[in-house]
Interface confidence: low
């Protein structure tokens, strides 16, 4: 299994109401993707084999798949109370902002420090499940024709 | 214009040693994670290993049949990769090329490679 | 560990639209590239992501990849394309493998 990953969290990200990405420039997103986000969730993964998890979170479109990637990528899920600050999620974060029209105004940033929750985060195997599945939304989103992933 | 350019190769005795150089230029090298593929005299390509780039943790793969054997680095400041080969086997025998990787591991610029011949 | 099988050899017309296929279990799920590499020279990739031409690559030259099987499709083949092809998925465990090889002859 993929060894402990020790990050810092200041600040929680979260999101207001469903966010229609139709209007994305999703060739930029995908370069973004493919030169570096890519690298980033292989990084969190290492050590893990691409068969330990199923995918089971699909979809149908490229702003369906960002959708996806969104909610998997900031929603904090049982099992993996956040990734919103690792590597990966950051750069997600800019390009969604930087390329899909508005988006930065559906985010609110919860400025108060994370007191309550422990400052050293072990990366959990539902977290490790999780970014599989982004994994392959991720692959979806850049291949919606050719890549049933 | 990227540019690789290997250098080191030889002809050197089985369980002997030798030290591959790779300089780089014309891009970003400590960005990049780095290759080295072989090809042995009339045959196909075959992967010897790579380099992930310092900000992914700079970490190493091989392949099994130099696994233990080869070891791979990097000097970013040097813009250069190593592959510094030990307890060599005739079967090791081959252009050495190194390789640049882009999206989906593939590999966008390669050098001209560099021959080593592993014979008594 | 995966496994990519080519077919030794292709031919084809000067003119005519030469096909090197690619196969491997479900390979349609994987990335696949290919390269070019002529004799004495390093290859070159020539289609990365399955159907992605780099820059520089003439658009006679294209890729698709679905089920067991890749293939390289060259339309108006030249004398110059005469080369070995090599393909190479990219798999999330075994991550560079590579095709045994084609040698694209261009007839006439």
């Known amino acids: 299994m993929g060894s402990s990953h020790h990050h810092h969290h200041h600040l929680e990200v979260l999101f207001q109401g469903p966010y229609d990405f139709t209007n994305c420039d999703f060739e930029k997103i995908k370069a973004a993707y493919l030169s570096t986000i890519s690298k980033d969730l292989i990084t969190y993964m290492s050590g893990t084999k691409s068969t330990e998890f199923n995918n089971t979170v699909s979809c149908s479109n490229r702003p369906h798949c960002l959708t996806e990637i969104q909610s998997l990528t900031f929603n904090p899920t049982a099992g993996c109370a956040s990734l919103a600050k690792e590597m990966f999620a950051m750069k997600t974060k800019a390009a969604l902002a930087i390329w899909c029209p508005g988006y930065s105004e559906t985010q609110i940033n919860a400025t108060q420090a994370m007191k309550k929750r422990r400052k050293r985060k072990v990366t959990t195997n539902k977290c490790l499940e999780q970014v599989s599945q982004l994994q392959g939304l991720w692959r979806r989103f850049n291949r919606p024709l050719l890549k049933q992933q | 214009e990227v540019q690789l350019v290997e250098s080191g190769g030889g002809l050197v005795k089985p369980g002997g040693s030798l030290r591959l150089s790779c300089a780089a230029s014309?891009?970003?090298?400590?960005?990049?994670?780095m290759h080295w593929v072989r090809q042995a005299p009339g045959k196909g390509l075959e992967w010897v290993g790579h380099?992930?780039?310092?900000?992914?943790?700079?970490?190493?793969d091989y392949a099994a049949p130099v696994k233990g054997r080869f070891t791979i680095s990097r000097d970013d400041s040097k813009n250069t990769l190593y592959l510094q080969m030990n307890s060599l086997k005739t079967e090791d025998t081959a252009v050495y090329y190194c390789?640049?990787?882009?999206?989906?591991?593939?590999?966008?610029?390669w050098g001209q490679g560099t021959l080593v011949t592993v014979s008594s | 560990s995966y496994e990519l099988t080519q077919p030794l050899s292709v031919s084809v017309a000067l003119g005519q639209t030469a096909r090197i296929t690619c196969s491997g279990d479900?390979?349609?799920?994987?990335?696949v590239h290919w390269y070019q590499q002529k004799p004495g020279q390093a290859p070159v990739l020539v289609i990365y992501?399955?159907?992605e031409r780099p820059s520089g690559i003439p658009e006679r030259f294209s890729g698709s990849n679905s089920g067991n099987t890749a293939t390289l499709t060259i339309s108006r083949a030249q004398a110059g394309d005469e080369a070995d092809y090599y393909c190479?998925?990219?798999?999330?465990?075994?991550?560079?493998?590579f095709g045994g090889g084609t040698k694209l002859t261009v007839l006439g």
């Open positions: 390789a640049r990787e882009i999206y989906y591991y593939a590999f966008d610029s």
């Open positions: 014309g891009f970003t090298f400590s960005d990049y994670w």
């Open positions: 380099i992930k780039s310092k900000t992914d943790a700079g970490t190493t």
């Open positions: 479900n390979i349609g799920s994987k990335y």
């Open positions: 992501g399955d159907n």
């Open positions: 190479q998925a990219a798999d999330w465990v075994d991550f560079y493998v």
